[in-house]
C-alpha cells in the first residue's frame, strides 16, 4: 500500500519565498511521520524535513542549507521556503514516510511541483528615479 | 520498547580500523536515520554520521575521509567502520536513533586505541 | 560548522535549588537546540528539543528557552538523581554538533 501524493503543477517565487503544499491520501493525525522535500529529477538534494510525533511539537529542519519552515494539516504538510536563489529553479518532489503505527508506509513518487524562482526586482522605482543623464 | 544493541573490537592499534555494529529491536527500522556518536573518555559528544534503511548518508566533514557507514535491513543492523585510527580516536562510541535529536541509544562501547 | 558553547563548565547547587545552565549558538540556530543528561556509564538522555519541548517522561522541573543563539535549561527544584553532566546539541545545520557540557554537582 503506497500513500498519494498532490502538488501544485508550478508555483513562483517571486520575493524568493513560496509555500508548496504536499496533500496526502492519508490522515497524519496521531502517527509519527516524516515528510521531506525533495530537489532535482533525482531527488538528490534534500530541501526540508518535517518530522512528526503524535501529539509533541513538531520538528523541522533542513541539512542542505535551506530556509525552511513547515506547517502540519491532518492529511498534508507545507513547505515555506525563504532565500530562495534564482539557479534553484528546479523540480520538487513531497516525500513522505509513516513509522508508526506499523506498517512503514511511503507514498508513490509524486508529478513534483516546478519552482521558479524570479530574481529579486532591482530597477529603480518610479517613484525614485535614479540620476537623470545629461 | 526500542532497544539498541552494539557490539565490536574494544582494542586496536594505530593505523587498524574500526569496526562496530548496532541491532535494533522493536519498533520500525525504516523511516528513521541510525546514527553514530562518540565521546573522548572526560570529554563531550562528537556526532560522527548516520544512516536511513536505504543507505541514505550524511557524515562530519571532519571525520568523512575515515568513516563508512552502512546499513542491513534484513537483520535491522547498521554498521561503523573507522580506518586508520590514531590515540584520538580512542572514546566510547554510541549508536542512536533519531537525525536531529537521538531519542534512543546503545549501551556504548569504549575502544582503545594503542601500540 | 555551528559551534556550541556551555556555561559555567562546573555548576555547584544544593538538592532544592535552582539550576540554571545556558549554552550558546556560534551562529542562529532558530529553536533547533536540544538537551541531554548524561550521567557517568550511561548514556546521554534526551531531555528537551526545539529550545523548549520536553521530550516524554522528563519531569515538569526541567525547562528549557531561548531562540536563537542563547539557549537555557533551567531545572526548578534539584533532585539527588539530577547531579550529572548536562549537554546542548544544535541540529540546524549539518554536522550535528555538541557543547562541551555543564556538569552539575553537589553543593
Known amino acids: 500500500n503506497k500513500i498519494l501524493v498532490k502538488q501544485s503543477p508550478m508555483l513562483v517565487a517571486y520575493d524568493n519565498a513560496v509555500n508548496l503544499s504536499c496533500k496526502y491520501s492519508y490522515n497524519l493525525f496521531s502517527r509519527e511521520f516524516r515528510a521531506s522535500l525533495h530537489k532535482g529529477l533525482d531527488s538528490a538534494v534534500e530541501v526540508c524535513v518535517v518530522y512528526g510525533n503524535y501529539s509533541q511539537q513538531l520538528q523541522v529542519y533542513s541539512k542542505t542549507g535551506f530556509n525552511c519552515d513547515g506547517k502540519l494539516g491532518n492529511e498534508s504538510v507545507t513547505f515555506y521556503l525563504q532565500n530562495l536563489y534564482v539557479n534553484q529553479t528546479d523540480i520538487y518532489f513531497c516525500k513522505i514516510e509513516v513509522m508508526y503505527p506499523p506498517p512503514y508506509l511511503d507514498n508513490e513518487k509524486s508529478n513534483g511541483t516546478i519552482i521558479h524562482v524570479k530574481g529579486k526586482h532591482l530597477c529603480p522605482s518610479p517613484l525614485f528615479p535614479g540620476p537623470s543623464k545629461p | 520498547q526500542v532497544q539498541l544493541q552494539q557490539w565490536g573490537a574494544g582494542l586496536l592499534k594505530p593505523s587498524e580500523t574500526l569496526s562496530l555494529t548496532c541491532a535494533v529491536y522493536?519498533?520500525?527500522?525504516?523511516?528513521?536515520?541510525w546514527n553514530w556518536i562518540r565521546q573522548p573518555p572526560g570529554k563531550g559528544l562528537q556526532w560522527i554520521g548516520e544512516?536511513?534503511?536505504?543507505?541514505?548518508?550524511n557524515y562530519n566533514p571532519s571525520l568523512k575521509s575515515r568513516v563508512t557507514i552502512s546499513v542491513d535491513t534484513s537483520k535491522n543492523q547498521f554498521s561503523l567502520k573507522l580506518s586508520s585510527l590514531t590515540a584520538a580516536d580512542t572514546a566510547v562510541y554510541y549508536c542512536?536513533?533519531?537525525?536531529?535529536?537521538?531519542?534512543?541509544w546503545g549501551q556504548g562501547t569504549l575502544v582503545t586505541v594503542s601500540s | 560548522e555551528i559551534v556550541m558553547t556551555q556555561s559555567p563548565a562546573t555548576l555547584s547547587v544544593s538538592p532544592g535549588e535552582r539550576a540554571t545552565l545556558s549554552c550558546r549558538a556560534s551562529?542562529?540556530?532558530?529553536?533547533?537546540l536540544a538537551w541531554y543528561q548524561q550521567k557517568p556509564g550511561q548514556a546521554p538522555r534526551l531531555l528537551i528539543y526545539?529550545?523548549?519541548a520536553r521530550a516524554t517522561g522528563i519531569p515538569a522541573r526541567f525547562s528549557g528557552s531561548g531562540s536563537g543563539t542563547e539557549f537555557t535549561l533551567t531545572i526548578s527544584s534539584l533532585q539527588s538523581e539530577d547531579f550529572a553532566v548536562y549537554y546542548c546539541?544544535?541540529?540546524?545545520?549539518?554536522?550535528?554538533?555538541f557543547g562541551g557540557g555543564t556538569k552539575v554537582e553537589i553543593k
Open positions: 542512536a536513533r533519531g537525525e536531529a535529536v537521538a531519542l534512543y
Open positions: 522493536g519498533g520500525s527500522f525504516s523511516g528513521y536515520y
Open positions: 544512516i536511513n534503511h536505504s543507505g541514505t548518508t
Open positions: 551562529q542562529s540556530v532558530n529553536s533547533n
Open positions: 526545539g529550545a523548549s
Open positions: 546539541q544544535q541540529y540546524y545545520n549539518w554536522p550535528l554538533t
